[in-house]
């Protein structure tokens, strides 16, 4: 079940040729677009095995990230895909092409991408509304104890300046709909509810619109009653991963718990050819557990370095407290090394996805 949803308009695929080495291409894509980056060999000659890197980390091919020797395609782009991309020679790590990619919530206009970033910087915004601080909007599930104050923000811009309105569970939401009222701060694009109670649970949607279009974001609020309950794990995490042999992988797990949670990362294993014990419970090994000295942020990420084929399999994030425990699992698929993918690519199979 999706706890937070964004309404996305799927745009066209924009393939962008690479800049001259040393230059940085500034690119803007709309949410949902297919980002295609092309890096032809300098002078048209052969350039040997290459790697694609985002923000300093090697990109792992997946169903959404398609890696070819001279081309990178990221399907259904989202804010998280913004960043600095480069294509490098595998052996020398020399940067062949460099791109700065920004993915906005406004679907791309279809015009020439070049200069869109600059136009925005000079204050000439595109007509339709877009999110100005998408990184502040990625916490779509909010679980807070009763009596706390909750603020939802949807900072946006557009030309003309868009209006913002709020829905609760799909219906217009006004102050008289809750005891204690609400504070609408239009300058800050925010909705504030003080001293939340269980009846405040639900889906809250900001609708930002002007004459050129509208965008919306939905947040889910869960109000935790003081009678404690077992931890809540964010839906969709950890997510299935596909990695190339020797690359690094991260699994993420977001835990919400009123009582102090104890978190474990487990890997499912086989014992004497069986995946489950005599009582039907799966065999596991503990990879990482909570510590008083370990921050929540560290615990919410399981990092696997230089993965091997033995690392493939099922991983579980498990969180417990005095009431009980919750667990979510994901799978890791490990593909052969990239040289093999490149060979396959040159044989006519364009992407290893």
């Amino acid at each position: 079940e999706s706890l937070g949803t964004e309404q996305r308009v799927v745009g066209r695929a924009a393939e962008v040729p690479g800049p001259e080495p040393g230059q940085q291409e500034q690119l803007v894509f709309g949410s949902g677009d297919a980002v295609e980056l092309s890096c032809p060999p300098p002078g048209g000659g052969p350039m040997g095995p290459t790697v694609w890197v985002k923000d300093g980390t090697g990109l792992v091919p997946s169903e959404r990230v398609l890696v070819g020797p001279q081309r990178l395609q990221v399907l259904n782009a989202s804010h998280e895909d913004s960043g600095a991309y480069s294509c490098r020679q595998r052996l020398t790590q020399r940067v062949l092409c460099h791109f700065s990619v920004r993915v906005t919530d406004a679907p791309s206009s279809g015009d020439d991408e070049d200069g869109e970033d600059e136009a925005e910087d000079t204050g000439v915004d595109t007509g339709a509304p877009y999110w100005t601080r998408p990184e502040r909007m990625d916490k779509k599930l909010l679980a807070v104890p009763a009596a706390n104050t909750v603020r939802f923000r949807c900072p946006a811009a557009g030309n003309p300046t868009p209006s913002i309105s709020w829905l609760k569970n799909g219906r217009e939401f006004r102050g008289e709909h809750r005891i204690g009222g609400i504070k609408l701060r239009h300058q800050q694009w925010s909705l504030v509810m003080e001293s939340v109670v269980p009846s405040d649970r639900g889906n809250y949607t900001c609708v930002v619109e002007n004459k050129f279009g509208s965008i919306r974001q939905t947040y889910t609020l869960d109000v935790l009653e003081r009678s404690p309950h077992r931890p809540i794990l964010q839906a969709g995490l950890p997510a299935n991963q596909t990695a190339v042999l020797g690359s690094d992988v991260e699994f993420h797990c977001k835990v919400y718990s009123d009582a102090q949670p104890h978190i474990q990362w487990l890997k499912h294993v086989e014992v004497n050819g069986s995946k489950v014990g005599p009582d039907g419970t799966p065999y596991v090994t503990v990879l990482k557990t909570a510590g008083a000295n370990t921050t929540d942020k560290e615990l919410e990420v399981l990092s696997l370095h230089n993965v091997t084929f033995e690392d493939a399999g099922e991983y579980t994030c498990l969180a417990g407290n005095s009431i009980g425990f919750s667990h979510h699992s994901a799978w890791l698929v490990v593909l052969p090394a990239e040289e093999e993918l490149v060979e396959a690519d040159e044989a006519g199979s364009v992407y290893a996805g």
Epitope: G277, D279, T281, T289, G320, I323
Partner: antibody, heavy 126, light 107 residues
Framework: QVQLVQSGAEVKKPGASVKVSCKAS????????MHWVRQAPGQGLEWMGW????????NYAQKFQGRVTMTRDTSISTAYMELSSLRSEDTAVYYC???????????????????WGQGTLVTVSS | DIELTQPPSVSVAPGQTARISCSGD??????ASWYQQKPGQAPVLVIY???DRPSGIPERFSGSNSGNTATLTISGTQAEDEADYYC?????????FGGGTKLTVLG
């Protein structure tokens, strides 16, 4: 807060059996594995085995196979350890200890004990 | 089966650093835990997963584990740290304890 409260001291004759109880409170009894550890006078800690209170599954140390039986009653959040064919060298303090292993899984590498009972002294003497 | 070996006793002056070792075949490939036990009391967890400290355990307790040896380090040892210390690890569904080390705080 988590508490493990064990039954009182026992004096038994060689060849008899003893059944020690361990009542858990402050957490969900069926969520975590329960282990039994014993300590003879002036000696070190010796692991005896575990029970999964959720499924009832058990695993005993080789040394105690055939003599020890671990059971549980989930309705009263209590684990039991019964040791039969007692001999004088079974004189020890017996501890129950909660393990940081969750009962939906069977751990190849069992983690640590975070809570212990107060111990039950079992004396075997003729 | 893995066997864990500890020195029977370690002595330290107050305020000094005490180190208690625990050796076992390829112990560094497994997690090690440490328990403190005072006379007439149940053991208390002081270090788990090699180096993590449960809440309520003073910062002077630390742990490490590599190769064949896990080490419990008590820096600035205090009189109240005098106790027996046991290392613990696992071996294929089973748990194993070291023989225990009596820590004496001199003076």
């Amino acid at each position: 807060q988590v508490q493990l409260v064990q039954s009182g001291a026992e004096v038994k004759k060689p060849g008899a059996s003893v059944k020690v109880s361990c009542k858990a409170s402050g957490y969900t009894f069926t969520s975590y594995y329960m282990h039994w550890v014993r300590q003879a006078p002036g000696q070190g800690l010796e692991w005896m085995g575990w029970i999964n209170p959720n499924s009832g599954g058990t695993n005993y140390a080789q040394k105690f196979q055939g003599r020890v039986t671990m059971t549980r009653d989930t309705s009263i959040s209590t684990a039991y350890m019964e040791l039969s064919s007692l001999r004088s060298e079974d004189t020890a303090v017996y501890y129950c200890a909660r393990n940081m292993a969750y009962t939906n899984y069977q751990y190849v590498n069992m983690p640590h004990f975070d809570y212990w009972g107060q111990g039950t002294l079992v004396t075997v003497s003729s | 089966d893995i066997e864990l070996t500890q020195p029977p006793s370690v002595s330290v002056a107050p305020g000094q650093t005490a180190r208690i070792s625990c050796s076992g075949d390829a112990l560094g490939d497994k997690y090690a835990s440490w328990y403190q036990q005072k006379p007439g009391q149940a053991p208390v967890l002081v270090i788990y997963d090699d180096s993590d400290r449960p809440s309520g355990i003073p910062e002077r307790f630390s742990g490490s584990n590599s190769g064949n040896t896990a080490t419990l380090t008590i820096s600035g040892t205090q009189a109240e740290d005098e106790a027996d210390y046991y290392c613990q690890s696992y071996d294929y569904f089973k748990l194993v304890f070291g023989g225990g080390t009596k820590l004496t705080v001199l003076g």
